[in-house]
């Protein structure tokens, strides 16, 4: 299951990924030395039956609807890290790979 | 990060897991011989701003606020598997580890 | 455009100190490293030390660590260079460049943007 | 610290030579090594960094290769506006360490 992948451009109603670039100098969250900016993506769309489902559990809790469950969301399913040079509490430099950061996959659950 | 845990009783609002027994037997799923019923749990709950958040992206992502995005949602963070007796499309009975049946753990990603 | 504006030339008696300015434009000042290099008439180049905007962190070659100081405003996106106990051997055009971060690791950085140089002439 | 041994010091070539310049460190550093050029009353300017890596908007006749503690700068076609003072500088370790100079003159 790869998931789907778009642009500002498609069409796509359904659960995809769509490029983004986080800038960290538009946030002006300087205590990060490097990247400046990097591509982080982001998931968007909808969430059809079946469509995507990342676990079996999604469908199974589909089929229970338990009180309160809202039906699956479009999600990272799969997501990679960056390596960061930035200064942490102490103001020492710290270099390091920041798991989380990169959206690779959407899926619904 | 270890999740928030509630039942039917609680009054929380937040993202949090409930307890939920999927029974096999209800839906009819009369190929899977054992367990005939099992605690899948599920997700539910609001994702107010840096709650529960699995991931530093899902915090870039609120922060960038590209057009589309929806805001993080209360989904499985962490999954475990059960062990299955089933019959496969042969008819074969297969004894497996099948993964992503149990919600461990829900956050807002 | 990245723009490094650095003052004008000095005159100094020995023991004097003097401090060269260096305004950025162009970009995010407090983002990026600002290095201080010297370059002493017909002589190679010279690393004095950097700093960071941010939060003025700093590094210093050691020859120079007891008599320079660098320091930042913000609020004017400018770095300073001082220089005290002034030498005649410090006679030099002083620059400030800009640190590039070409990849993420500590020393995946070129510089960029020079300022014009400050010439510091120390003279009796 | 780390030393920075440029060599030679003085270059004497014409338009059209194609003119290599050379820098040795004390110790390895691990390919962090920049190029400069400096015309006289200038500042340098960046040419190439991490040893072979051309800086955006520098002709394609400078290139930079080496690894370890030795590494070279190369003009392939040297032109009148090439004819200035070039520097290497490691940044591998503080205190940053630059080369003493290679002064490129037109014979």
């Known amino acids: 299951n790869l998931g789907l992948d778009c642009d500002e451009h498609s069409s796509e109603s359904r659960c995809c990924r769509y490029p983004l670039t986080v800038d960290f100098e538009a946030f002006g969250w300087d205590w990060i030395i490097a990247p400046k900016r990097y591509k982080a993506n982001y998931c968007s769309g909808q969430c059809e039956y079946m469509f995507m489902q990342k676990y079996p559990h999604t469908h199974l809790v589909q089929q229970a609807n338990p009180r309160g469950s809202a039906g699956p969301c479009c999600t990272p399913t799969k997501m990679s890290p960056i390596n960061m040079l930035y200064f942490n509490d102490k103001q020492q430099i710290i270099y390091g790979k920041i798991p989380g950061m990169v959206v690779d996959r959407c899926g619904c659950s | 990060n270890l999740g928030l845990d509630c039942d039917e009783h609680s009054s929380e609002s937040r993202c949090c897991r409930y307890p939920l027994t999927v029974d096999f037997e209800a839906f009819g799923w009369d190929w899977i011989i054992a367990p005939k019923r099992y605690k899948a749990n599920y997700c539910s709950g609001q994702c107010e701003y840096m709650f529960m958040q699995k991931y530093p992206h899902t915090h870039l992502v609120q922060q960038a606020n590209p057009r589309g995005s929806a805001g993080p949602c209360c989904t499985p963070t962490k999954m475990s598997p059960i062990n299955m007796l089933y019959f496969n499309d042969k008819q074969q009975i297969i004894y497996g580890k099948i993964p992503g049946m149990v919600v461990d753990r829900c956050g807002c990603s | 455009q990245v723009q490094l504006v650095q003052s004008g030339a000095e005159v100094k008696k020995p023991g004097a100190s003097v401090k060269v300015s260096c305004k950025a434009s162009g970009y995010s000042f407090t983002g990026y490293f600002m290095h201080w290099v010297r370059q002493a008439p017909g002589q190679g180049l010279e690393w004095i030390g950097n700093?960071?905007?941010?939060?003025?962190?700093?590094n210093y070659n050691q020859r120079f660590k007891a008599r320079a100081t660098l320091t930042v405003d913000k609020s004017t996106s400018t770095a300073y260079m001082e220089l005290r106990s002034l030498r005649s051997d410090d006679t030099a055009v002083y620059y400030c460049?800009?640190?590039?971060?070409?990849?993420?690791?500590?020393?995946?950085?070129?510089?960029?943007?020079w300022g014009q140089g400050t010439l510091v002439t120390v003279s009796s | 610290d780390i030393q920075m041994t440029q060599s030679p010091s003085s270059l004497s070539a014409s338009v059209g030579d194609r003119v290599t310049i050379t820098c040795k460190a004390s110790?390895?550093?691990?390919?962090?090594l920049s190029w400069f050029q400096q015309k006289p009353g200038k500042a340098p300017k960046t040419l190439i960094y991490?040893?072979?890596r051309l800086v955006d908007g520098v002709p394609s006749k400078f290139s930079g290769s080496g690894s370890g503690t030795d590494y070279t700068l190369t003009i392939s076609s040297l032109q009148p506006e090439d004819f200035a003072t070039y520097y290497c500088l490691q940044s591998d370790e503080f205190p940053l360490t630059f080369g003493q100079g290679t002064k490129l003159e037109i014979k």
């Open positions: 460049a800009r640190r590039y971060y070409y990849g993420t690791g500590p020393a995946d950085w070129y510089y960029d943007v």
């Open positions: 991490r040893a072979n």
């Open positions: 700093i960071y905007p941010y939060n003025s962190v700093s």
């Open positions: 110790q390895d550093i691990n390919s962090y």
